[in-house]
């Protein structure tokens, strides 16, 4: 598709005569008829196969033609065509005299013709005008002509359609030959593919507009070359997406188990020494005078009940002092001045004389002790409960209240967290101080092996044409994410897109 343009420049008819030699009255009011047709060695009358056009009256006798609209006509004259330009043509230009206002052929007498010229030849498409001048005995016509392509048509024959665009379907302008020239930042056959930020990781990154670098799931950073740790990860990093590699001092699947509780929490009080003893556990070694799990309790010298025979204990700066009841003396009121005659045995204890009545001994009933049966038996003094269990006096006996995870009369047995078979899908259970841990068989993960994970379906690199491979965890199969221009389950088929 294109346009044959004819620019009339000057017409000379000094004598103001018709082709017949007869003069025009009062002068030759001149207009032109142009006929464009296929190449003919000898130009003959017949249909104007490439088009025709007429002008209004442009002047009288001799005149120059302006380069614009003249009296409603256009200069240059436009002869559009909607076919491939063949490169050759025939052109007939007739000058006519218009006695009245009606310029239709049927309204004019045949002898109103002033002159007729016919040319033929080759003409390539181009912007340059070809200047020509045709002279007869009485007239002269100077004109120029060219063939140019219509908007959006390019090439030697105006046969290549190319419409510049900057939208989802392409980002390009058109070269003179009709080839696409991508706008900056775009590439591909139809300039639909953005050129990502320089250095953007080929597999982990992509872009939807030029100089962008967007990361695929699991990757981060300007160039998408840094991984993102697992959602549940607390104190860890990664070297591949969704990993959780623990920072120093942390353990467990999500690095949430504190292996360095002493440093992170300083639980031991009053200058005690802290020792890490596994995940989230520790032991405090108390300084003299302190007790408790965290050495938070101050010891009293009287706490050990050193005074015998009902003596009362008083704390002092440098220790303690026993105030003895009547009939007793000594540092701990351990010596008696009494005999059985003084009924020294309390709580139903029976008295036995010793050393010919110089001293005595009390035989105490159950639940009582002391040289005078004055003390109720505390069966917890020996700290019989293991693993931090709490000792409780229960009449003639004692019992241990165990911490979670322990059992037995003296809390001496660790309750196995594995007893209830918590690991799913054939996972192996391990008892740890902090709880249990499951070792999962291939294809499963999670704290209890409850998450089905894929055997890497992408390991065999099944995707073609640099497609990205993902594993479908629900079916253990691969999914190929095709780059632009390819389709198929393995991105194996190229897509042939027509020009849009």
């Amino acid at each position: 598709s294109g346009v044959f343009q004819l620019q009339l420049q000057e017409f000379v008819n000094e004598r103001g005569v018709l082709a017949s030699g007869r003069p025009c009255e009062p002068g030759c009011r001149t207009f032109f008829r142009v006929c464009l047709k296929h190449f003919q060695a000898v130009v003959s009358p017949g249909p104007c196969t490439f088009g025709s056009v007429s002008t209004p009256v442009l002047g009288t006798n001799s005149f120059a033609v302006r380069d614009d609209s003249s009296g409603g006509g256009r200069n240059p004259l436009q002869l559009p065509f909607n076919f491939t330009w063949p490169g050759t043509f025939s052109l007939i230009i007739e000058a006519w005299h218009a006695p009245g206002d009606d310029l239709r052929p049927e309204a004019l007498p045949p002898d109103a013709l002033i002159s007729k010229i016919a040319i033929q030849g080759s003409l390539a498409v181009g912007q340059n005008w070809l200047l020509d001048e045709q002279t007869s005995t009485l007239t002269r016509l100077r004109y120029s002509y060219r063939v140019i392509c219509s908007d959006n048509y390019y090439g030697d024959n105006c046969s290549r359609l190319c419409k510049k665009r900057n939208d989802h379907f392409g980002h390009y302008v058109c070269q003179p030959d009709g080839n696409l020239s991508c706008l900056p930042g775009w590439t591909g056959e139809y300039c639909q593919q953005p050129i990502c930020l320089s250095g953007c990781h080929e597999q982990n990154g992509y872009c939807s507009k030029p100089a962008e670098c967007l990361c695929r799931p699991g990757w981060q950073g300007r160039l998408c070359n840094e991984c993102i740790p697992h959602n549940g990860c607390r104190h860890g990093t990664c070297s591949t997406p969704w990993q959780c590699t623990c920072d120093e001092g942390w353990g467990g699947l999500f690095c949430d188990q504190d292996l360095n509780y002493c440093t992170h929490h300083s639980p031991c009080k009053n200058g005690a020494t802290c020792s890490n003893s596994g995940q989230r556990s520790y032991t405090c070694t108390c300084r003299p005078g302190y007790t408790g799990v965290d050495c938070e309790l101050e010891l009293s010298e009287c706490d050990s009940n050193p005074c015998r025979n009902g003596g009362s204990c008083k704390d002092q700066e440098d220790g303690y002092h026993c105030l003895c009841p009547p009939g007793y003396y000594g540092l701990h009121c351990e010596h008696s001045t009494l005999s059985c005659a003084d009924s020294p045995c309390f709580n139903g204890g029976s008295c036995r004389e010793r050393n010919q009545g110089a001293s005595y001994a009390c035989e105490c009933p159950p639940n009582f002790t002391g040289s005078n049966c004055e003390k109720k038996v505390d069966r917890c003094t020996s700290n019989p409960c293991a693993n931090g269990g709490q000792c409780l006096n229960r009449g003639p006996s004692r019992m241990c209240r165990c911490r979670p995870g322990f059992t037995g009369t003296y809390c001496e047995r660790h309750v196995s967290d594995c007893a209830r078979n918590p690991c799913a899908h054939g996972g192996t259970c391990h008892d740890l101080e902090s709880g249990l841990m499951c070792t999962c068989p291939a294809g499963f993960s999670g704290r209890r092996c409850e998450v089905r994970t894929s055997i890497d379906a992408c390991a065999s690199s099944p995707c073609f044409n640099r497609a990205t491979c993902y594993t479908d965890l629900s079916t253990d199969t691969f999914v190929c994410n095709c780059p632009y221009g390819f389709v198929g389950s393995r991105c194996e088929f190229p897509v042939g897109l027509p020009p849009s």
């Epitope: 799931p217 840094e226 993102i228 740790p229 607390r234």
Partner: antibody, heavy 118, light 107 residues
Framework: EVQLVESGGGLVQPGRSMKLSCAAS????????MAWVRQAPTRGLEWVAT????????YYRDSVKGRFTISRDNAKSTLYLQVNSLRSEDTATYYC???????????WGQGTLVTVSS | DIQMTQSPASLSASLGETVTIECRAS??????LAWYQQKPGNSPQLLIF???NLADGVPSRFSGSGSGTQSSLKINSLQSEDVASYFC?????????FGGGTKLELK
């Protein structure tokens, strides 16, 4: 226990600025990308901005680009959102969250309400 | 941007019932989908990621499934503490986008 505590919200006039903060604890802050997500009754949940942990690369939703700035201080385990040229459509509860634009938002703060009104 | 369409917008169910919430993406999101639960007056909490993986501490009565553009969240044996709004979110394409939410109430 992971904790994210937002602050800095309140009533502000259109065109004005404010700075939201989010104090993080219970995880190693410097290791994780962070994000702001907002929730308005009319528009539901909307991702607002993201910052990577590795190099501090930032991303924003189109409607806030050039007005909002996300930043982080790893030494203080704190995430920030500087909001400028506020509009009535920015009225929402702003949540601080651990996550990127291409990962789930694993943990969320309790939110801070920003009301833009004259 | 990828559009996420959740259905239904609200639903009522009885205790012990099984409930299913659907989420449709405007294009393939390759299983990069999460579900969140938001109880009244609280912030959202991650329930499920990568379409079918349960987040830490989430009860096993919750499950997720789907592929391509269709995903669903299933709650078996509904409990009173499950009364909340539920949101889906895709993180396959930039920017991440959320569904409009489903409000779950007790009958």
């Amino acid at each position: 226990e992971v904790q994210l505590v937002e602050s800095g919200g309140g009533l502000v006039q259109p065109g004005r600025s404010m700075k939201l903060s989010c104090a993080a604890s219970g995880f190693t802050f410097r290791n994780f990308p962070m994000a702001w997500v907002r929730q308005a009754p009319t528009r539901g949940l909307e991702w607002v901005a993201t910052i990577s942990s590795s190099d501090g690369t930032t991303y924003y939703r189109d409607s806030v680009k050039g007005r909002f700035t996300i930043s982080r201080d790893n030494a203080k385990s704190t995430l920030y959102l500087q909001v400028n040229s506020l509009r009535s459509e920015d009225t929402a509860t702003y949540y601080c969250s651990r996550g990127y634009y291409n990962s789930p938002f694993a943990y969320w703060g309790q939110g801070t309400l920003v009301t833009v009104s004259s | 941007d990828i559009q996420m369409t959740q259905s239904p917008a609200s639903l009522s169910a009885s205790l012990g019932e099984t409930v299913t919430i659907e989420c449709r993406a405007s294009e393939d999101i390759y299983s990069n989908l999460a579900w969140y639960q938001q109880k009244p007056g609280n912030s959202p909490q991650l329930l499920i990621f990568d379409t079918n993986n349960l987040a830490d501490g989430v009860p096993s009565r919750f499950s997720g499934s789907g592929s391509g553009t269709q995903s669903s969240l299933k709650i078996n044996s509904l409990q009173s503490e499950d009364v909340a709004s539920y949101f889906c979110q895709q993180y396959n394409n930039y920017p991440p986008t959320f569904g409009g939410g489903t409000k779950l109430e007790l009958k």
